[in-house]
């Protein structure tokens, strides 16, 4: 079935009993209106198994499937199911056809933005093309981060977009670093935000037919210095078979630049602890957070000697944090046996007396063990 100016199955009459599968080819930018059952008894529309909401750019409403302007992501399988009985009333596959413009590209809806479009479309007030990208209304971000607000829209004629801050026209001239406006993304970007950037940001999208607006709230969080935060439960106790590969994961969150070490607890002269009560450790890996894979410790072809306790240690200019896990290595001939890894229960102070190479951060620091 090849669609022309508008895809419609009208009127909304009861469907025939034998609903065969249909394929509809829809041009990008084209409105779609498909009916299923009588209006008051219309079925529910589903796309790829998810029921369509009664509002939005793509909606299922009173037995009607409506797409304001067909986009590439709208392609797919649509089902209309009878209310209550879940009988399939319509089984449609919408396929992306050529754009309604001169472009032969099948990816993006260029008709929204082509003011020289020679096709005589009905005028259309602006509407949001990607409302799912606008769901996050409140942006609370740390100072220094980049912030982006987007209001992707379309209409005919092509709408313009302008931005307001706290109700006033906003061009960023008083902002250190200025702002970046990407009209093709319908976006406002501010790099390295500061507390004075807090406020309400409004995108105003308008054309000759109408206008729409949307408010974003920006809160800039002043950085509170703290030692690194390690995600709970990582690294995790792990059981492996001799000869296998093991990955231990440690997720580190830190405002200040963190440095990470992976340590293995070792035995010296038959003891795990020195005379001072601190454990002996061997540094396996050291790097800063921007280094590749620093948060993962890879152990290749493990042997029985690799069994033991491993610690992820993260430090910044404020302090240190660390968490540990046990690796249990099973013999190859008995892979089904599993042993509970011993719980790490230390109340001692832990001191790493190894040269850490971490810009003196770790030097002589005593830190509480925490899990």
């Amino acid at each position: 079935l090849e669609a022309s100016e508008e895809v419609e199955l009208e009127p909304c009459l009861a469907p025939s009993l034998e609903q065969q599968e249909q394929e509809l080819t829809v041009a990008l930018g084209q409105p779609v209106r498909l009916c299923c059952g009588r209006a008051e008894r219309g079925g529910h529309w589903y796309k790829e198994g998810s029921r369509l909401a009664p509002a939005g750019r793509v909606r299922g409403w009173r037995g009607r499937l409506e797409i304001a302007s067909f986009l590439p992501e709208d392609a797919g399988r649509y089902l209309c199911l009878a209310r209550g009985s879940m009988i399939v009333l319509q089984n449609l596959t919408l396929i992306t056809g050529d754009s309604l413009t001169s472009s032969n590209d099948d990816e993006d809806p260029k008709s929204h933005r082509d003011p020289s479009n020679r096709h005589s479309y009905p005028q259309q007030a602006p509407y949001w093309t990607h409302p799912q990208r606008m769901e996050k209304k409140l942006h609370a971000v740390p100072a220094g981060n980049t912030v982006k607000f987007r209001c992707p829209a379309a209409g005919n004629p092509t709408p313009t977009i302008r931005w307001l801050k706290d109700g006033q026209a906003f061009h960023g001239e008083n902002r250190i670093g200025g702002i970046r406006l990407r009209h093709q993304h319908w976006s406002l970007v501010m790099e390295s935000v500061v507390p004075s950037d807090r406020g309400t940001y409004t995108c105003l999208v308008e054309n000759a037919v109408g206008s729409i607006r949307y408010n974003y709230l920006l809160d800039v969080l002043e950085r509170s210095p703290h030692r690194p935060i390690l995600q709970a439960g990582l690294p995790a106790n792990t059981t492996a078979v001799v000869g296998s590969d093991v990955e231990l994961l440690c997720k580190v969150y830190s405002d200040a630049q963190p440095h990470i070490q992976w340590l293995k607890h070792i035995v010296i002269n038959g003891s795990s602890f020195g005379a001072d009560g601190f454990p002996y450790v061997q540094v396996l890996k050291t790097a800063d957070i921007n280094s590749s894979e620093v948060e993962v410790l890879y152990l290749r072809n493990v042997s029985a000697e690799d069994a033991g306790e491993y610690t992820c240690l993260a430090g910044n200019s404020i302090g240190l944090s660390y968490q540990s896990a046990w690796l249990t290595v099973l013999p190859e001939e008995d892979p089904t046996w599993t042993a509970a890894a011993p719980e790490a229960r230390y109340t001692d102070k832990l001191e790493f007396r190894h040269d850490s190479g971490l810009n003196d951060i770790f030097e002589a620091q005593k830190i509480e063990w925490h899990e």
Partner: antibody
Framework: QVQLLESGGGLVQPGGSLRLSCAAS????????MSWVRQAPGKGLEWVST????????EYADSVKGRFTISRDNSKNTLYLQMNSLRAEDTAVYYC????????????WGQGTLVTVSS | DIQMTQSPSSLSASVGDRVTITCRAS??????LNWYQQKPGKAPKLLIY???NLQSGVPSRFSGSGSGTDFTLTISSLQPEDFATYYC?????????FGQGTKVEIK
């Protein structure tokens, strides 16, 4: 079908200049933002510069700002990169790439042109 | 600039394996992340855009997930033609950045 063809690469001495071109076909060129992305030998990808369809938006990576200039001629369906004050670290394969509308995914790439900066 | 950290930097896998590559951003980038595949001597190829959308013509064994700072590219069943280098790319900032790449090699 969409095609992007770069040209203009070659060997140049440090401090020298080169102008790369990217001829586009198979789509409405003026509707799309275009970018240059480079890749030093044996290294990863590095974004260089972007220009929107109407040339009203231009952005550069810090590493090339003030030395490289991106431009386009929509009547000729061509993207350009003027590279001045070239350095050894600019040695790379330079790709031109098209951005999807509403997003900055590079959905089509040229085959690349090699720029070698060496004395 | 927003830093993108990929892990692992390389991995060995066999045909049929499930492969997962992760990418972490130094700050929240919403879902403004793409994944590319590159083979030696060739231009990169777009696989996934906006974190989870499969590019037209890309096999369905490729999938992407994540939002905010942590993202994943998954190949559900590795095929011989999938041995390549994979890059993530953020476009939340106007100064785009790529991850350093993950090379997927034959075991």
């Amino acid at each position: 079908q969409v095609q992007l063809l770069e040209s203009g690469g070659g060997l140049v001495q440090p401090g020298g200049s080169l102008r790369l071109s990217c001829a586009a076909s198979g789509f409405t060129f003026s509707d799309y933002a275009m970018s240059w992305v480079r890749q030093a030998p044996g290294k990863g990808l590095e974004w260089v510069s972007t220009i929107e369809g109407d040339s009203n938006y231009i952005e550069y990576a810090d590493s090339v700002k003030g030395r490289f200039t991106i431009s386009r001629d929509n009547s000729k369906n061509t993207l350009y990169l003027q590279m001045n004050s070239l350095r050894a670290e600019d040695t790379a394969v330079y790709y031109c790439a098209r951005e999807r509308t509403y997003s900055s995914a590079f959905d089509y790439w040229g085959q690349g042109t090699l720029v070698t900066v060496s004395s | 600039d927003i830093q993108m950290t990929q892990s692992p930097s390389s991995l060995s896998a066999s045909v049929g394996d499930r492969v997962t590559i992760t990418c972490r951003a130094s700050q929240d980038i919403s879902s403004d992340l793409n994944w590319y595949q590159q083979k030696p001597g060739k231009a990169p190829k777009l696989l996934i855009y906006d974190a989870s959308n499969l590019q037209s013509g890309v096999p369905s064994r490729f999938s992407g997930s994540g939002s905010g700072t942590d993202f994943t590219l998954t190949i559900s069943s590795l095929q011989p033609e999938d041995f390549a280098t994979y890059y993530c790319h953020q476009w939340y900032s106007t100064l785009y950045t790529f991850g350093q790449g993950t090379k997927v090699e034959i075991k």
